[in-house]
């Protein structure tokens, strides 16, 4: 297993609709054809997997149908979008990139993007 540098923004504020997008960029040492991207969430020392996708270079990322993540790739960059976020989902979202094929296997883990999520203010009751 060889190490690889992964860069991602330090802080992102999700939209009022609970959507956060950020770029995860990896310094590929070679010409990988198969890449696996995993998003991990760290909150209060607990780490959980949010979503993961394996893709062939030049193709779209395919997450599971019920995943809250979508993404696109361009060269050594992956543009990740996480939706359906609520205030309780605020936390550090870590991008993990694995170059699966061809060998050698490379692994890179970013420092994480702190995603702040603000629940929208409830609309005041109105009489119609």
């Amino acid at each position: 297993c060889k190490a690889m540098h992964v860069a991602q923004p330090a802080v992102v504020l999700a939209s009022s609709r609970g959507i956060a997008s950020f770029v995860c960029e990896y310094a590929s040492p070679g010409k990988a054809t198969e890449v696996r991207v995993t998003v991990l969430r760290q909150a209060d020392s607990q780490v959980t997997e949010v979503c993961a996708a394996t893709y062939m270079m030049g193709n779209e990322l395919t997450f599971l149908d019920d995943s809250i993540c979508t993404g696109t790739s361009s060269g050594n960059q992956v543009n990740l979008t996480i939706q359906g976020l609520r205030a309780m989902d605020t936390g550090l979202y870590i991008c993990k990139v694995e170059l699966m094929y061809p060998p050698p296997y490379y692994l890179g883990i970013g420092n994480g993007t702190q995603i702040y999520v603000i629940d929208p203010e409830p609309c005041p009751d109105s009489d119609f």
Epitope: P9, A10, V11, V12, L13, S16, A43, D44, Q114, I118
Partner: antibody
């Protein structure tokens, strides 16, 4: 080193607007956020809101909603805070601060805004 | 909305003494999102502690933070002359982010 430099002191009349700038250097501007905090004379710190320089999304304190606008210019690594319909109780030192994963650091030197007729 | 209440309002101590500052939240705050700042007259605040207990870069080890849930503490083990200032706690785990009203540490 990481630094935030704010614009100079302002004197404004009630009802006017003020726009304070905060120029960042020493780090990747779009990777972080900028928060604005004010401090009335002899008082404590009041959080006004913040902007994510990465995507421009904002979160404002409820009491200032509708009067405050925070923006960034990523070409010059500068954040701006505009406050409209100024009142005498808006007289304060206004600070910008870099928002990290779980801290405000560093802070700008502060900008004194005086609202007086 | 989470309200932070700091106590005492003023702490009168001598150099070399230990200072214990309290910050109480009206609702539970994730310790990841609790910070302490120091402010001296005419200066901008300076980050001391983040994540409730992690010292910021360049902060002497006489400063320490602890606590969880609704009760947090900043301790200065031995006061130095330059430590006499106002200290603020802050939460940024849920919006609106908020500061406590401050504790002034003054020379006795």
């Amino acid at each position: 080193q990481v630094q935030l430099v704010q614009s100079g002191a302002e004197v404004k009349k009630p009802g006017a607007s003020v726009k304070v700038s905060c120029k960042a250097s020493g780090y990747t501007f779009t990777s972080y956020g900028i928060s604005w905090v004010r401090q009335a004379p002899g008082q404590g710190l009041e959080w006004m809101g913040w902007i994510s320089a990465y995507n421009g999304n904002t979160n404002y304190a409820q009491k200032l909603q509708g009067r405050v606008t925070m923006t960034t210019d990523t070409s010059t690594n500068t954040a701006y805070m505009e406050l409209r319909s100024l009142r005498s109780d808006d007289t304060a030192v206004y600070y910008c601060a870099r928002v990290g994963a779980n801290w405000f650091d560093p802070w700008g030197q502060g900008t004194l805004v005086t609202v007086s007729s | 909305e989470i309200v932070l209440t700091q106590s005492p309002g003023t702490l009168s101590l001598s150099p070399g003494e230990r200072a214990t500052l309290s910050c109480r939240a009206s609702q539970s705050v994730s310790s990841s999102y609790l910070a302490w700042y120091q402010q001296k007259p005419g200066q901008a605040p300076r980050l001391l502690i983040y994540g409730a207990s992690s010292r910021a870069t360049g902060i002497p080890d006489r400063f320490s933070g602890s606590g969880s849930g609704t009760d947090f503490t900043l301790t200065i083990s031995r006061l130095e002359p330059e430590d006499f200032a106002v200290y603020y706690c802050q939460q940024y785990g849920s919006s609106p982010w908020a500061f406590g009203q401050g504790t002034k540490v003054e020379i006795k």
